[in-house]
């Protein structure tokens, strides 16, 4: 059964997790035309279902496009190096879904723009992070 | 291997329905955006449009809107360009294209070998 | 819709020797925030289907031998060959992305002499 400090820490894992998504979004919203409409046709794969940590597997997979869109949109006011973001973010899941158990994602059929991608993820944190507190 | 296959020549009468085909193989399918260009006998490249087919968001050239219809089948990994009513001006190559995670973002990395459609009564 | 237009529209090349084609757009490929610029070149050897040589001003795709290059800025571009070899015949094309729709140059023809 986990402990509360492993609960606590979970919590703030979590916390730091949401803190880095939305400060993407964040910086993408602010984005004018014509950025934002170049990125929001570089598409992702969304998760089937995503209600336990182990589904952090589905976010892990797209880290790399997700670099990879931010590298191709850098901005000067972007004062984040997307390799340093996304290695954070990566830590983070990497802890958070464990490495013990082999978790294979299920996809939606549907793919979904950045915007979208962000949101459903920072959905899926805010959710875990209400059922732990 | 990474390759785009495209449906056989075809030679129609005026006014007769068309689609031709683009299966896509060696690569994620649904990842990226899938292009159709025109070219006309002796002349350039020309632009149609393009699909996403894991989503099937579709965006068409001005100059064709309204001309053809792009779609695809993801389950079979396949992109097609339709016509419901061909012209004579509609005589020329077309190719499909893999455009990347976006089309803005990347060039067309990938060809196929072009269908030719000719259209003569 | 962004015009691109290239000179000349034929090539006469000597096998050995430099050259180099020029594209020119009706507005700014250049998007100063990311600091890209969204052009591409393409080849289409005879009877063979186009193949992508440059992207992003001057990136070389992936088999691209470095006799090739792309420069320029913002509305003039141009594509280099350092050293031209018998197989580089063809027409060659531009392309912009920066804005939909995407749009060709017309193309540029290059031959040996």
């Known amino acids: 059964a986990p402990t509360s400090s492993s609960t606590k820490k979970t919590q703030l894992q979590l916390e730091h997790l949401l803190l880095d998504l939305q400060m993407i979004l964040n910086g993408i919203n602010n984005y004018k035309n014509p950025k934002l409409t170049r990125m929001l046709t570089f598409k992702f794969y969304m998760p089937k279902k995503a209600t336990e940590l182990k589904h952090l597997q589905c976010l892990e997979e797209e880290l790399k496009p997700l670099e990879e869109v931010l590298n191709l949109a850098q901005s000067k006011n972007f004062h984040l190096r997307p390799r340093d973001l996304i290695s954070n973010i990566n830590v983070i899941v990497l802890e958070l879904k464990g490495s013990e158990t082999t978790f294979m994602c299920e996809y939606a059929d549907e793919t979904a723009t950045i915007v979208e991608f962000l949101n459903r993820w920072i959905t899926f944190c805010q959710s875990i992070i209400s059922t732990l507190t | 291997e990474v390759q785009l296959v495209q449906s056989g020549a075809e030679v129609k009468k005026p006014g007769e329905s068309l689609k031709i085909s683009c299966k896509g193989s060696?690569?994620?399918?649904?990842?990226?955006?899938i292009g159709w260009v025109r070219q006309m006998p002796g002349k350039g490249l020309e632009w149609m449009g393009i699909?996403?087919?894991?989503?099937?968001?579709?965006r068409y050239s001005p100059s064709f809107q309204g001309q053809v219809t792009i779609s695809a089948d993801k389950s079979i990994s396949t992109a097609y360009l339709q016509w419901s009513s061909l012209k004579a001006s509609d005589t020329a190559i077309y190719y499909c294209?893999?455009?990347?995670?976006?089309?803005?973002?990347?060039?067309?990395?990938?060809w196929g070998q072009g269908t030719t459609v000719t259209v003569s009564s | 819709d962004i015009v691109m237009t290239q000179t000349p529209l034929s090539l006469p090349v000597t096998p050995g020797e430099p050259a180099s084609i020029s594209c020119r757009s009706s507005?700014?490929?250049?998007?100063?925030?990311?600091?890209?610029?969204?052009l591409d070149w393409y080849l289409q050897k005879p009877g063979q289907s186009p193949q992508l040589l440059i992207y992003?001003?001057?990136y070389r795709a992936s088999g691209v031998p470095d006799r090739f290059s792309g420069t320029g800025s913002d509305t003039d571009f141009t594509l280099k060959i350092s050293r031209v070899e018998a197989e580089d015949v063809g027409v060659y094309y531009c392309?912009?992305?920066?804005?939909?729709?995407?749009?060709f140059g017309g193309g540029t023809k290059v031959e040996i002499k």
């Open positions: 992003t001003l001057s």
């Open positions: 060696g690569y994620r399918f649904t990842s990226y955006w």
């Open positions: 507005q700014s490929l250049l998007d100063s925030d990311e600091g890209n610029t969204y």
């Open positions: 294209t893999r455009q990347g995670r976006s089309f803005y973002y990347y060039g067309m990395d990938v």
């Open positions: 699909i996403h087919p894991g989503d099937s968001d579709t």
């Open positions: 392309m912009q992305r920066i804005e939909f729709p995407l749009t």
